[in-house]
């Protein structure tokens, strides 16, 4: 799901699943602004005042970010340039599932998408030879 | 093999114009933005001019502002410098270059001369 | 804009030698630096990315460090083919801008 048009920049954002106890990664992407300090990213989740994470001028901020995602949201800042705006979660939760809104502003204008994430005890499907 | 290859430079008078092209093979070029960066003789390096991958974001350098126009037609895999009212000092060699967390692939470059 | 200026201009070193370049920004870039190297007659060469990211196929005896307004390119031990002039570059901003350039000569 994605915005676009006049004063609109495309979000693109996919569907994800997460390991309860692991990290795991909301993705999405944007077509980059070269001027990188003009580029805002902001997770937000359904439900929840204020942030899962902010990312402006080049770099986290994180003064209104709610407290359940304290000490455990990254983005990729050196894969912003080419417009990674994915969200890194540290030690994934049951409560944790919901939808999540990724949020870009650039020169150009803004934009942005919706994801659906899943947290659960997934594990791989052994093989028996 | 990644390869940008630049063509379309030479000797021009002050006043006049020229369309420098570069040719990309060996990636999807339009998932990557592009630069042009040139080097006068004996000089050091100068970004010249910027594009993303779909065009929605264009910059210039403010020495070739109103006279060069960036373009690219992902369609021909092909990024383009057009450059109206050459000077003096644009005299320089013009390398295309692919834009990922750095310029990470440069082409071999092209010679724009401007001289009477 | 944002400035960018090397130091030193020019330095003459050995084989072996562990050599170190710096690079200074007019205002914060973060770590929004990139370092190339150019050797006469061709293109420039990534070295490193944000700040200290080794491009790969980069031998690992480059490594770059820094963030703010302060950074550093070091050869850990210099060899033949790294005798060349080093750029650093910021694209925290536009426009992008190079620092003037650093000449490694043999001594």
């Known amino acids: 799901f994605g915005i676009s048009g006049k004063h609109f920049i495309t979000v693109t954002t996919f569907t994800s699943a997460g390991n309860i106890g692991e990290d795991g990664t909301l993705s999405c992407t944007f077509e980059p602004d070269i001027k990188l300090n003009g580029i805002v990213i902001q997770w937000l989740k359904e439900g929840i005042k204020g942030l899962v994470h902010e990312f402006k001028e080049g770099k986290d901020d994180l003064s209104q970010q709610h407290e359940m995602f304290r000490g455990r949201t990254a983005v990729f800042a050196d894969q912003v340039v080419v417009g990674n705006a994915s969200l890194r979660l540290k030690n994934v939760q049951l409560t944790d599932a919901g939808t999540y809104t990724c949020y870009i502003r650039t020169s150009k204008g803004k934009g942005n998408a919706n994801l659906e994430y899943k947290t659960g005890a997934f594990s791989m499907p052994e093989i028996n030879v | 093999e990644v390869q940008l290859l630049e063509s379309g430079g030479g000797l021009v008078q002050p006043g006049g114009s020229l369309r420098l092209s570069c040719a990309a093979s060996?990636?999807?070029?339009?998932?990557?933005?592009m630069h042009w960066v040139r080097q006068a003789p004996g000089k050091g390096l100068e970004w010249v001019a910027s594009?993303?991958?779909?065009?929605?974001?264009?910059y210039y350098a403010d020495s070739v502002k109103g006279r060069f126009t960036i373009s690219r037609d992902n369609s021909k895999n092909t990024l383009y410098l057009q450059m109206n009212s050459l000077r003096a000092e644009d005299t320089a060699v013009y390398y295309c270059?692919?834009?990922?967390?750095?310029?990470?692939?440069w082409g071999q470059g092209t010679t724009v001369t401007v001289s009477s | 804009d944002i400035q960018m200026t090397q130091s030193p201009s020019s330095l003459s070193a050995s084989v072996g030698d562990r050599v170190t370049i710096t690079c200074r920004a007019s205002?914060?870039?973060?770590?929004?630096l990139n370092w190339y190297q150019q050797k006469p007659g061709k293109a420039p060469k990534l070295l490193i990315y944000?700040?200290?990211s080794l491009q790969s196929g980069v031998p690992s005896r480059f490594s770059g460090s820094g963030s703010g307004t302060d950074f550093t390119l070091t050869i850990s031990s210099l060899q033949p083919e790294d005798f060349a002039t080093y750029y650093c570059?910021?694209?925290?901003?536009?426009?992008?801008?190079f620092g003037q350039g650093t000449k490694v000569e043999i001594k």
């Open positions: 205002q914060s870039i973060r770590s929004y």
């Open positions: 060996g990636f999807t070029f339009s998932s990557y933005g």
């Open positions: 570059q910021q694209y925290y901003s536009t426009p992008l801008t």
């Open positions: 270059a692919r834009a990922s967390s750095g310029m990470d692939v």
């Open positions: 594009i993303s991958s779909s065009s929605g974001y264009i």
């Open positions: 944000y700040a200290s």
